[in-house]
Interface confidence: medium
């Protein structure tokens, strides 16, 4: 169920194309493209490419993307966009001008003096956006998203964006001014995770960030389930950055408890994270206890 | 000859509003955020918020937010700030800085 | 907020002597760009403020040389090395690293 058809309009193509592209970022980092069939591979691949040319269709002459060519385009969308297509950059040819594109777009019309992201034309199918949905705490979040896609897409735009360098830094000031005074787990554990690729979560940030963990295992908020995934997902990267192994085994499990297999209505983000995050933990901390994900792919009839 | 050339002084009820204009010439508008500062009588510069000219982005003083709205007309090189809800407390010369200085506006809340 | 103490309040100098104003700020002014936007301001009698120096030490074209900046951290001081009768008014120190943006209470230099 996670190997899908892209189609729709330039959400819903990327909301299709968001569980192909970390399935297969899965059982590549995994290796276990032999449990489901190598033979496999060739036919997921060949959807994401579909869903790269479907997607260039919403590409807008300013680079940025939205649902649709006349629609303003979206700063989310925009960052969400980089972030699939900077992980889908060693699984098909994705032109580096459109991805480096998108990040220039993002840096010269969307970010303010203080660093802060900011959203003039929300996604229509907000269920696509995750724990940022409805989050009083907007300004932190959305910028700690678009912060990290930013760092995910910095060695390949670095060359052409200039002040890549300049903006991430930017972005990073705001967090770690405003990272104390967050009341939502979620967004302690997104905007941790943004820092911590910078190596900035550290000494009292450090402190709120870990001990915002419930149960020293998971982060969460009241509310919808598929968002706490969502945001443990986020927490556990920020622990394998810091190199925390002692915390991630029962964040981990956790995770793995969830026995949340991605896919279905408002999953996007929490999909895409999970994934992320379990393929990280398996490729640092290989010592650890293998996670048996049961992560049943299947090709679409032709 | 870099010039920020603002609008002229103004006499405003209590309660009202007021926009006020800074017109850039002799440098490339965009290429420098904006910044607004208030002073008070005799006091010190207090600062208000800046407004990035390329894309309109703005980041204000907690003190400012919801008193002053930053915007900027790039086709004309002008920025404005417009004050609302006026109280003789916010009578004083307001600045705008690029790092240029403009003349100051005069504010006088008065009924 | 990142409060900038300016000290003396008033400085009254003979033209052709040295001046110092310090400025001192209550977080370090490092940004994590590596560089120090501590800028300094003259304000004269009547007149709206004009930018003397910026980030630390660097003049602004136009500025006289008399006028250096130095410091790092949290302590900065600006020295006008020879006082001239145009130099009367008020300095400001102000910084640009941390949000809000904030200034030093201003020192009045008076001419004896």
């Known amino acids: 169920h996670l190997i899908v058809t892209p189609s729709g309009c330039g959400e819903q193509n990327m909301i299709g194309m968001t569980p192909t592209v970390i399935a297969v970022h899965y059982l590549d980092e995994t290796e276990q493209w032999e449990k489901f069939g190598l033979e496999k591979r060739q036919g997921a691949l060949e959807l994401i490419k579909k869903g790269y040319t479907q997607q260039l269709a919403f590409r807008q002459p300013s680079s940025a993307f939205a649902a649709f060519v006349k629609r303003a385009p979206s700063t989310w969308l925009t960052a969400y966009v980089v972030k699939v297509f900077s992980l889908a950059v060693n699984l098909i040819a994705i032109d580096s001008q459109v991805l480096c594109g998108a990040v220039k777009w993002l840096i010269l019309e969307k970010q303010k003096p203080d660093g802060v992201f900011q959203e003039d034309a929300p996604v229509i199918h907000q269920e696509m956006i995750g724990g940022l949905r409805n989050n009083n705490e907007k300004d932190m979040a959305l910028t700690a998203f678009v912060l990290i896609s930013l760092q995910e897409a910095k060695d390949i735009c670095e060359e052409q964006v200039n002040s890549l360098p300049g903006s991430i830094t930017k972005a990073g000031d705001f967090l770690e001014a405003n990272y104390m005074n967050l009341q939502r787990s979620y967004t302690v554990a997104i905007a941790g995770y943004a820092l911590a690729q910078m190596g900035r979560l550290k000494g009292p940030l450090l402190n709120k960030f870990l001990t915002t963990a419930k149960d020293k295992n998971r982060w969460e908020d009241p509310g919808k389930q598929l968002y706490n995934v969502e945001a443990t997902s986020y927490a556990l990267l920020a622990l394998l950055q810091l190199k925390d192994f002692d915390f991630v085994p029962p964040v981990v499990r956790w995770l793995n408890e969830q026995r949340y297999y991605g896919g279905g209505y408002g999953s996007t983000q929490a999909t895409f994270m999970v994934f992320q995050a379990l393929a990280q933990y398996q490729k640092d901390a290989p010592d650890h206890q293998e996670l048996n994900l049961d992560v049943s792919l299947q090709l679409p009839s032709r | 000859e870099v010039q920020l050339q603002q609008s002229g002084p103004v006499l405003v009820k209590p309660g009202a509003s007021v926009k006020m204009s800074c017109k850039a010439s002799?440098?490339?508008?965009?290429?420098?955020?904006m910044n607004w500062v208030r002073q008070s009588h005799g006091k010190s510069l207090e600062w208000i918020g800046v407004?990035?000219?390329?894309?309109?982005?703005?980041s204000y003083n907690q003190k400012f937010k919801g008193k002053a709205t930053l915007t900027v007309d790039k086709s004309s090189s002008t920025a404005y700030m417009e004050l609302n809800s006026l109280t003789s407390e916010d009578s004083a010369v307001y600045y705008c800085?690029?790092?240029?200085w403009g003349q100051g506006t005069s504010v006088t809340v008065s009924s | 907020d990142v409060v900038m103490t300016q000290t003396p309040l008033t400085l009254s100098v003979t033209i052709g002597q040295p001046a110092s104003i310090s400025c001192k700020s209550s977080?370090?002014?490092?940004?994590?760009?590596?560089?120090?936007?501590l800028n300094w301001l003259l304000q004269r009698p009547g007149q709206s403020p004009k930018r003397l120096i910026y980030?630390?030490?660097k003049v602004d074209s136009g500025v006289p040389d008399r006028f250096t900046g130095s410091g790092s951290g949290t302590d900065f001081t600006l020295k006008i090395n020879r006082v001239e009768a145009e130099d009367l008014g008020v300095y400001y120190c102000?910084?640009?690293?941390?949000?809000?943006?904030?200034f030093g209470g201003g020192t009045k230099l008076e001419i004896k």
């Open positions: 002799g440098y490339t508008f965009t290429a420098y955020y």
């Open positions: 980030l630390v030490s």
């Open positions: 102000w910084q640009g690293t941390h949000f809000p943006r904030t």
């Open positions: 977080q370090s002014l490092l940004d994590s760009d590596g560089k120090t936007y």
């Open positions: 800085s690029s790092p240029y």
């Open positions: 407004i990035n000219p390329y894309n309109g982005g703005t």
